[in-house]
Interface confidence: medium
Amino acid sequence: FERTRSLQDPCSNCPAGTFCDNNRNQICSPCPPNSFSSAGGQRTCDICRQCKGVFRTRKECSSTSNAECDCTPGFHCLGAGCSMCEQDCKQGQELTKKGCKDCCFGTFNDQKRGICRPWTNCSLDGKSVLVNGTKERDVVCGPSPADLSPGASSVTPPAPAREPGHSPQ
């Protein structure tokens, strides 16, 4: 089928970085400056993304791939393609419509981004609090009093607290 299609459609022979130019007898023409085609057989090239304002260029546009942006210092990416930037706050804070606000008692944020989240409830796992939580750090759960027999030294780290890394794709 692919072979038949390529015989019928000359555009299928145009590689990435080119487009099938209807104005020139369907010749494969290179993408113009500031445009790209990431797949073959395209009839147009896409305009390159521009990293302006709070965005900065992480990867330059090429004839076969779009530019990638990240955010200037003091800001971090939002969204799967870093299509948005958001102001950083300090650890122990979260960004609200009124600006950066300290985490309420019983919640924490160990990053400059994201939201304040409740401390781990050690008692749900039958554990006791070994290290108290703060605005910046979750509690550390330790063994329950009944577990404190000679030789017992297990300390349970809290569930993953950090938001996963957001690297623009």
Epitope: L78, G79, A80, G81, M84, K97, G114, I115, E163, G165
Partner: antibody, heavy 123, light 108 residues
Framework: EVQLVESGGGLVQPGRSLRLSCAAS????????MHWVRQAPGKGLEWVSG????????GYADSVKGRFTISRDNAKNSLYLQMNSLRAEDTALYYC????????????????WGQGTMVTVSS | SYELTQPPSVSVSPGQTARITCSGD??????AYWYQQKPGQAPVLVIY???ERPSGIPERFSGSSSGTTVTLTISGVQAEDEADYYC???????????FGGGTKLTVL
């Protein structure tokens, strides 16, 4: 290319069940909260459910609480919605969408959307 | 239950400015987001956090906030801007995500 593709919709009788899937590609799926949003024919958008990156936080709209279950498999880059005890008012186009970050936050926006899968509940 | 109120329709001539409002009691506290939806297509986020524009969204789209009302403004409206527009936010306690009823923008 960042992409979400929903599947699993169809015609189902009231009271029956259906499971929707959403396949993600082009981004690190496990880094983002995911949501289901629905749109009844000719109507507006309604948030249905959301799940944080690590499945540690889950939320539902009152209209589906106790009947729908959201889940995800980061190894398979997939999001799911198990819909039980379906009603006529659940008839809608169901979209999956990414949140802005990993945690489920009530002021989240919906960044990347799929094209939707249609669920029709009728006898 | 918490509601966001939008006008059902707004009409404007090409090149003019369209303004679509969204009202809700919690908007002084909660951010608003705006989506554009064309027939048969999925919604697209055009404004986030009241007034910020995602990369790739034309500069003619802007957002503003004043008290209990947020406004989406489209300057120099083009035919391709004809679509349904939805605002989205949360209630004051941060319990519910809510969409407005949508506004159909007609370009005359």
């Amino acid at each position: 290319e960042v992409q979400l593709v929903e599947s699993g919709g169809g015609l189902v009788q009231p009271g029956r069940s259906l499971r929707l899937s959403c396949a993600a590609s082009g981004f690190t799926f496990g880094d983002y909260a995911m949501h289901w949003v629905r749109q009844a024919p000719g109507k507006g958008l309604e948030w249905v459910s959301g799940i944080s990156w690590n499945s540690g936080s889950i939320g539902y709209a009152d209209s589906v609480k106790g009947r729908f279950t959201i889940s995800r498999d980061n190894a398979k880059n997939s999001l799911y919605l198990q819909m039980n005890s379906l009603r006529a008012e659940d008839t809608a186009l169901y979209y999956c969408a990414t949140g802005l970050g990993g945690w489920l936050r009530i002021d989240d926006a919906f960044d990347i959307w799929g094209q939707g899968t249609m669920v029709t509940v009728s006898s | 239950s918490y509601e966001l109120t939008q006008p059902p329709s707004v009409s404007v001539s090409p090149g003019q400015t369209a303004r679509i409002t969204c009202s809700g009691d919690a908007l002084p506290k909660q951010y608003a987001y705006w989506y554009q939806q064309k027939p048969g297509q999925a919604p697209v986020l055009v404004i986030y956090k009241d007034s910020e524009r995602p990369s790739g969204i034309p500069e003619r789209f802007s957002g503003s906030s004043s008290g209990t009302t947020v406004t989406l403004t489209i300057s120099g409206v083009q035919a391709e801007d004809e679509a349904d527009y939805y605002c989205q936010s949360a209630d004051s306690s941060g319990t519910y995500q809510v969409f407005g009823g949508g506004t159909k923008l007609t370009v005359l």
